[in-house]
């Protein structure tokens, strides 16, 4: 009688993560007597997957009923795949004995596990950045199978080329993950500007995952001051104001320095925004020049976001002050911060 | 109770091959993967190779492939090594271990042989 | 081939201290550690399987853990015959493969 065969007709099986592989086997002969076991891997470190004779293998349920004296089939289905059951599966005849021996291999079947992606995380730099500077974002997303991977960035739908992707390990795994960095210039304009990272896979059929930062929590638009003179309210008293803008973010405090002596500090409240997200904000200072001898030197001192503080200073002349000298030029900017100086 | 009973210390010429033993006793010879490690004089423990008695499988280190040859004889419960091609950096001692016939975690690398000393001189 | 970073490779201190060696594995190995212990003449006896697990005649201040891709064997209250060298095994994949060793010494 001819010597028994073990037959695995798939070379290779493909299953989704979550869903059941079903590995094939038979034998060509009933003799020897003798159990089945699956094995995945070769060598000592394979693992034990079924053992027809003993044992208990929640995940695995035989095709045919195994136990029938004539039975030839043993086949097994596995169920809930993931990732980590990927590998090449051997069914392995033994001889009934006292231990059981091995007798025959199968040739194996290979087991790919597709696995879909994680949402990707984009996540930004840590400290903020002004516009002109160039920021670094990363991008990651794990667990996929196979190991092949499209990722690409976006910056408010326009392309970005400058990116350096990685994908680990670089060897044979169960699973996969990718890490890639992308340089992104700032503009004063990125208040409302998004970043993309853009991951495609076998698993996602044509259908991309998306993770998004947006630049409003990476820029700092530093404002732009302008005091200016505005015309007289009253018999000696002079209205001085003074513009903070295109800032962001909003946290802003503003002090009032005369001749150089804190006049008054307070914080940015009742602020416009403009449609590109930076903010405007105004201060007014009510002067009494009959309170001064000499010139009185004003200076709007600006601290935004914590940052360095900037000035702008105004030369108010005590000795002639027309009832007109400057102009208020930015209509928009409303403001009602009045305070005397005696 | 199990043992790996080893063959003695060995001298030989650099050029030359020396083939040790390891006489199992104590458990069925052929539900195991017979190991071999080496370890040079003051040195750490490097993994040779294994082989599997009931068909002769046998997996190497890459490093030792070609320096190393695994055969059992099943009837004696014996395994052996030959180390040809003796260098001065094949002086080591010698340990035989086992790994059940499938990754059994229980029983990777318990039971261990004495050592062979291999002392290579010109 | 997977990595076994083994550290200290030295390691001095007394009669009752608790100690801890580690090893770090340079791929994903599971559970699938062992540490042996290795005698001054060359005898080597397993101690601790599938990271954590003791072997029976072991004594109990032995303990393994993992914590991440770290390794630990930890002694609590050194004793005189602790005071060998002692070695990691990785036995996930081929080649399988040891820590450097980290010698025990007595303070």
């Known amino acids: 009688e001819e010597e028994l065969q073990v037959i695995q007709p798939d070379k290779s099986v493909l299953v989704a993560a979550g869903e059941t592989a079903t590995l094939r086997c038979t034998a060509t002969s009933l003799i020897p007597v003798g159990p089945i076991q699956w094995f995945r891997g070769a060598g000592p470190a394979r693992e034990l997957i079924y053992n027809q004779k003993e044992g208990h293998f929640p995940r695995v349920t035989t095709v045919s009923e195994s136990t029938k004296r004539e039975n030839m089939d043993f086949s097994i289905s596995i169920s809930n795949i993931t990732p980590a059951d990927a590998g090449t599966y051997y069914c392995v005849k033994f001889r009934k004995g006292s231990p059981d021996t091995e007798f025959k291999s199968g040739a194996g079947t290979e087991l790919s596990v597709r696995a879909k992606p994680s949402a990707p995380v984009v996540s930004g730099p840590a400290a903020r950045a002004t516009p002109q500077h160039t920021v670094s974002f990363t991008c990651e997303s794990h667990g996929f199978s196979p190991r092949d991977i499209t990722l690409k960035w976006f910056k408010n739908g326009n392309e970005l080329s400058d990116f350096q992707t990685n994908v680990d390990p670089v060897g044979e795994s169960v699973s996969y993950s990718i890490h890639s960095t992308a340089k992104v210039v700032l503009t004063r304009e990125d208040v409302h500007s998004q970043v993309i990272c853009e991951v495609a896979h076998v698993t996602l059929q044509g259908d991309p995952l998306r993770g998004t930062a947006n630049l409003s929590e990476t820029i700092r638009v530093p404002p732009t001051l302008e005091v200016t003179q505005q015309p007289v309210r009253a018999e000696n008293q002079v209205n001085v104001t003074c513009q903070v803008r295109k800032f962001y973010p909003q946290r802003l405090q503003l002090t009032w320095l005369e001749n150089g002596n804190v006049s008054r500090t307070e914080t940015a409240s009742t602020v416009t925004e403009n449609k590109d997200g930076t903010y405007n904000w105004m201060s007014w200072l009510l002067v009494n020049v009959s309170a001064h001898r000499d010139d009185v030197k004003l200076t709007c001192q600006v601290e935004h976001d914590g940052q360095p503080a900037v000035s702008k200073s105004h030369d108010l002349k005590v000795s002639a002050h027309p009832k007109e000298q400057g102009s208020n030029t930015a209509a928009e900017n409303t403001g009602s911060n009045e305070r005397n100086i005696y | 109770e199990v043992q790996f009973q080893q063959s003695g210390t060995v001298l030989a010429r650099p050029g030359t091959s020396v083939k040790m033993s390891c006489k199992a006793s104590g458990s069925t010879f052929t539900s195991y993967w017979m190991h071999w490690v080496k370890q040079g004089p003051g040195q750490g423990l490097q993994w040779i190779g294994a082989?599997?008695?009931?068909?002769?499988?046998?997996t190497y280190n890459q490093k030792f492939k070609g320096k190393a040859e695994l055969t059992v004889v099943t009837s004696t419960s014996t395994a052996y090594m030959e180390v040809s091609s003796l260098t001065n950096e094949d002086s080591a001692v010698y340990y035989c271990t086992r790994s059940f016939y499938y990754s059994l975690d229980a029983a990777w690398f318990v039971y261990w042989g004495q050592g062979t000393l291999v002392t290579v001189s010109a | 081939d997977i990595q076994m970073t083994q550290s200290p490779s030295s390691l001095s201190a007394s009669l009752g201290e608790r100690v801890s060696l580690t090893c770090r594995a340079s791929?994903?190995?599971?559970?699938?550690l062992n540490w042996l212990q290795q005698e001054p003449d060359g005898t080597i006896k397993r101690l601790i399987y599938a990271t954590s697990s003791l072997d029976s005649g072991v004594p109990k201040r032995f303990s393994g853990s993992r914590s991440g891709s770290d390794y630990s064997l930890t002694i609590s209250g050194l004793e005189s015959e602790d005071f060998v060298d002692y070695y990691c095994?990785?036995?996930?994949?081929?080649?399988?493969?040891f820590g450097g060793g980290t010698k025990l010494e007595i303070n």
């Open positions: 095994l990785q036995y996930a994949s081929s080649p399988f493969t």
């Open positions: 082989i599997y008695p009931v068909n002769n499988d046998t």
């Open positions: 791929q994903d190995i599971g559970s699938r």
